[in-house]
């Protein structure tokens, strides 16, 4: 599998989507999981609901949701309130049994916020009919990691 | 009606190269995967792989890994299984058969009539 | 690799009897298994899957039930037809096993 990778600005959400065969995956749940180390477990960060039919509706666990689109076969991971911390290589799998396939190999980069070292005066403020959470918009930028590129940097 | 209808039983010798097909017919080819399994003379069943030939991703069991080689060919739906060299021990009956994915569970639910291949010198 | 055992290997039941067939998992499969009928020089029938789901067009008299590592086939009433071997296969775990066959006989 090819690594994706999504960036992200810190204290933005940050959108990842998961294209699949949704007749290759029919009736299986979907995860979202972290890759611990290079060749370590991927440690289930959270997974679609129990049953496959309400795989629709969007769970949470902590600041991340996911949510799978069956019949378009895309399952979206939203990361809200993104943190230095999330970076990392994360997997998107389909689950039967005790078997999990990668659909998609995800590395997420966090970004530091522009805004974080600005004078007040060079901010913008919403209008007063508006807030902080109905301009605010999620980003996210995808790409396909190079030949030769390693998603985890050497261990010394 | 689906159906899976296989090719004609073999005689080969030891060293030989087979290739048997499974030609799917009445609903999606591309949509479900195909399994293979096989059955020596007055033995039980054993898994050996499957394959889905929307993307021709192919698994094994690890008792078949680089034993044979399943591949489709979309086109004219349909699945093959084959050897490179022959052993006599590969001597057996070889059914294909479609894996039905669902909410209850998945089935191998309709099957080849299987094809005999009898390796012997 | 997961290990099916079936129970008895041989049964042998008189016409319209109940014919009860084990198959245990050497660890837990779920209820990711199916139950299948062959009779000689045929194909295998799909009979049950999820472990308790009944095949299109089997009939009422074939019932399974278990989950985990223990499940039984009941035939409720075994019918001339019935006669034949029957084998359970789990898919919870790669590869997918078969059990070694329960052969079912006229006693």
């Known amino acids: 599998h090819n690594t994706t990778v999504f960036q992200g600005v810190a204290g933005q959400s940050l959108q990842v989507s998961c294209p699949y065969d949704s007749m290759k995956h029919w009736g299986r749940r979907k995860a979202w999981c972290r890759q611990l180390g290079e060749k370590g477990p991927c440690q289930r960060v959270v997974s679609t609901h129990n049953l496959w039919l309400l795989s629709f509706l969007r769970r949470w666990n902590g600041s991340t949701a996911i949510t799978d689109d069956t019949l378009g076969g895309t399952l979206t991971i939203t990361l809200r309130n993104l943190q230095p911390h999330d970076a990392g290589l994360y997997q998107c799998q389909s689950l039967h049994g005790s078997e999990a396939d990668t659909l998609r190999k995800v590395l997420v980069e966090v970004l530091a916020d522009p805004l974080d070292h600005r004078d007040a005066g060079d901010l913008w403020f919403p209008g007063e009919s508006e807030s902080f959470e109905d301009a605010h918009v999620e980003h996210s930028i995808s790409r396909s990691l190079l030949e030769g590129e390693i998603p985890f940097p050497p261990t010394s | 009606e689906v159906q899976l209808v296989q090719s004609g039983a073999e005689v080969k010798k030891p060293g030989e190269s087979l290739k048997i097909s499974c030609k799917g017919s009445?609903?999606?080819?591309?949509?479900?995967?195909i399994g293979w399994v096989r059955q020596m003379p007055g033995k039980g069943l054993e898994w050996m792989g499957i394959?889905?030939?929307?993307?021709?991703?192919?698994r094994y069991s690890p008792s078949f890994q680089g034993q044979v080689t399943i591949s489709a060919d979309k086109s004219i739906s349909t699945a093959y299984l084959q050897w490179s060299s022959l052993k006599a021990s590969d001597t057996a009956m070889y059914f294909c058969?479609?894996?039905?994915?669902?909410?209850?569970?998945?089935?191998?639910?309709?099957w080849g009539q299987g094809t005999l291949v009898t390796v012997s010198s | 690799e997961i290990v099916m055992t079936q129970s008895p290997a041989t049964l042998s039941v008189s016409p319209g009897e109940r014919a009860t067939l084990s198959c245990r998992a050497s660890?837990?499969?779920?209820?990711?298994l199916a139950w299948f009928q062959q009779k000689p020089g045929q194909a295998p029938r799909l009979l049950i899957y999820?472990?308790?789901t009944r095949a299109t067009g089997i009939p009422a008299r074939f019932s399974g039930s278990g989950s985990g590592t223990e499940f039984t086939l009941t035939i409720s009433s075994l019918q001339p037809e019935d006669f034949a071997v029957y084998y359970c296969?789990?898919?919870?775990?790669?590869?997918?096993?078969f059990g070694q066959g329960t052969k079912v006989d006229i006693k």
């Open positions: 999820g472990a308790s």
């Open positions: 394959i889905y030939p929307g993307d021709a991703d192919a």
């Open positions: 009445g609903y999606s080819f591309t949509s479900y995967w």
């Open positions: 660890q837990s499969v779920s209820s990711n």
């Open positions: 058969a479609r894996r039905r994915q669902g909410i209850f569970g998945d089935a191998l639910d309709f």
């Open positions: 296969l789990q898919d919870n775990n790669f590869p997918p096993t």
